[in-house]
Interface confidence: low
């Protein structure tokens, strides 16, 4: 028969023939002949290989280097990578997660619309009328403004997005 | 103010084992902000970081190639302190000892851990 | 691994001179480096962290700068006490070869 010029799913075409791939968490040791199969071997230990692959070397797992202000999130396995994060109040650069930085505070006026995680920065939004932030924060909204009516007094001095209004009592009618 | 008080001989046969502790007063070797190192200075002057150990939920050490095969740090929580092991060494160990403690400073950059805090260095030469 | 290399392995000053010391990295280390002084005979200490900014109790007149692969340690007088050797070290821990910085 004609040699195969390709080949099924999970293998591959070497010297004319169609070898298997190793599965994930296992490396190509050597390659399949006429007689023989492809032969694989589980990754070592703090290795890993995340597909049906021939590969002759594992990945090694990733470090999440303590210096970055890295732990780990998720241990890797043979098939899959370390997953890591930051430590508490720090949120990754980037979406490989390679070093940290602090989270972000709200400046007043402006109050905390999405906490901040490990992954993502903390979102700020600007305090809408009605709401006020007078702190710089990673934590709090915007706080609305204190209702005078509702304690049966007048508004002596309009809030601002900084500022809280500011109650007095109503002026008594005069004779 | 942190200090680490280095104790250990200061002469040991090839083939031995060198082994030395690091005493910590004024923190703790279970934070969760520091690392404890070993650090060597060769007669030529070199440093060398060794390894470390640190807490971070559960205990991981770190250890530089050329010593991992013989090398093992260990916290020891009950005394507050940490211990250098060196298997089989040999004259080229022979050196200067250092324990320290590393932390993040803070910084505008990424977290990065600096040696604040030395030992007072324990000479160790290698000989029969 | 990244290798780093001072230069000049000596330079020899008067007190009240200005010192340049140079730390090159063989790879960007971004702004992951810190400057240690070293006397005869006592362990290394702190000078500098993260390429610029000084340790605890240490005097204005040192100075760091760089990033990348490019840093400068800077005395701006020397004072009979800064004759030292002065390291600078990366953030996977290694250190350079030092610079003796002595008396002329």
């Known amino acids: 028969p004609e040699p195969p010029t390709a080949c099924r799913e999970k293998q591959y075409l070497i010297n004319s023939q169609c070898c298997s791939l190793c599965q994930p968490g296992q490396k190509l040791v050597s390659d399949c002949t006429e007689f023989t199969e492809t032969e694989c071997l589980p990754c070592g230990e703090s290795e890993f290989l995340d597909t049906w692959n021939r590969e002759t070397h594992c990945h090694q797992h990733k470090y999440c280097d303590p210096n970055l202000g890295l732990r780990v999130q998720q241990k890797g396995t043979s098939e899959t990578d370390t997953i890591c994060t930051c430590e508490e109040g720090w949120h990754c650069t980037s979406e490989a997660c390679e070093s940290c930085v602090l989270h972000r505070s709200c400046s007043p006026g402006f109050g905390v619309k999405q906490i901040a995680t490990g992954v993502s920065d903390t979102i700020c939004e600007p305090c809408p009328v009605g709401f006020f932030s007078n702190v710089s924060s990673a934590f709090e909204k915007c706080h609305p403004w204190t209702s005078c009516e509702t304690k049966d007094l007048v508004v002596q001095q309009a809030g601002t997005n900084k500022t809280d209004v500011v109650c007095g009592p109503q002026d008594r009618l005069r004779a | 103010q942190v200090q680490l008080q280095q104790s250990g001989p200061g002469l040991v046969k090839p083939s031995q084992t060198l082994s030395l502790t690091c005493a910590i007063s004024?923190?703790?070797?279970?934070?969760?902000?520091?690392?404890w190192n070993w650090i060597r200075q060769s007669p030529s002057r070199d440093l060398e970081w060794l390894g470390r150990?640190?807490?971070?939920?559960?205990?991981?050490?770190d250890y530089v190639g050329s010593v991992k095969s013989r090398i093992i740090i260990n916290p020891d929580t009950s005394n507050n302190q940490f211990s250098l092991q060196l298997n089989s060494v040999t004259p080229e160990d022979t050196a200067i000892y250092y324990c320290?403690?590393?932390?993040?400073?803070?910084?505008?950059?990424?977290?990065?851990?600096?040696?604040?805090?030395w030992g007072q260095g324990t000479t160790v030469t290698v000989s029969s | 691994e990244i290798v780093l290399t001072q230069s000049p392995a000596t330079l020899s000053l008067s007190p009240g001179e200005r010192a340049t010391l140079s730390c090159r990295a063989s790879q960007s280390v971004s702004s992951y480096l810190a400057w240690y002084q070293q006397k005869p005979g006592q362990a290394p200490r702190l000078l500098i962290y993260?390429?610029?900014n000084r340790a605890t109790g240490i005097p204005a007149r040192f100075s760091g700068s760089g990033s990348g692969t490019d840093f400068t340690l800077t005395i701006s007088s020397l004072e009979p006490e800064d004759f030292a050797v002065y390291y600078c070290q990366q953030r996977s821990n290694t250190f350079g070869p030092g610079t003796k910085v002595d008396i002329k």
């Open positions: 004024g923190d703790s070797v279970s934070s969760n902000s520091a690392t």
């Open positions: 993260d390429a610029s």
């Open positions: 150990t640190y807490y971070r939920s559960k205990w991981y050490r």
């Open positions: 320290t403690r590393a932390q993040w400073l803070g910084g505008d950059y990424p977290y990065y851990y600096s040696m604040d805090v």
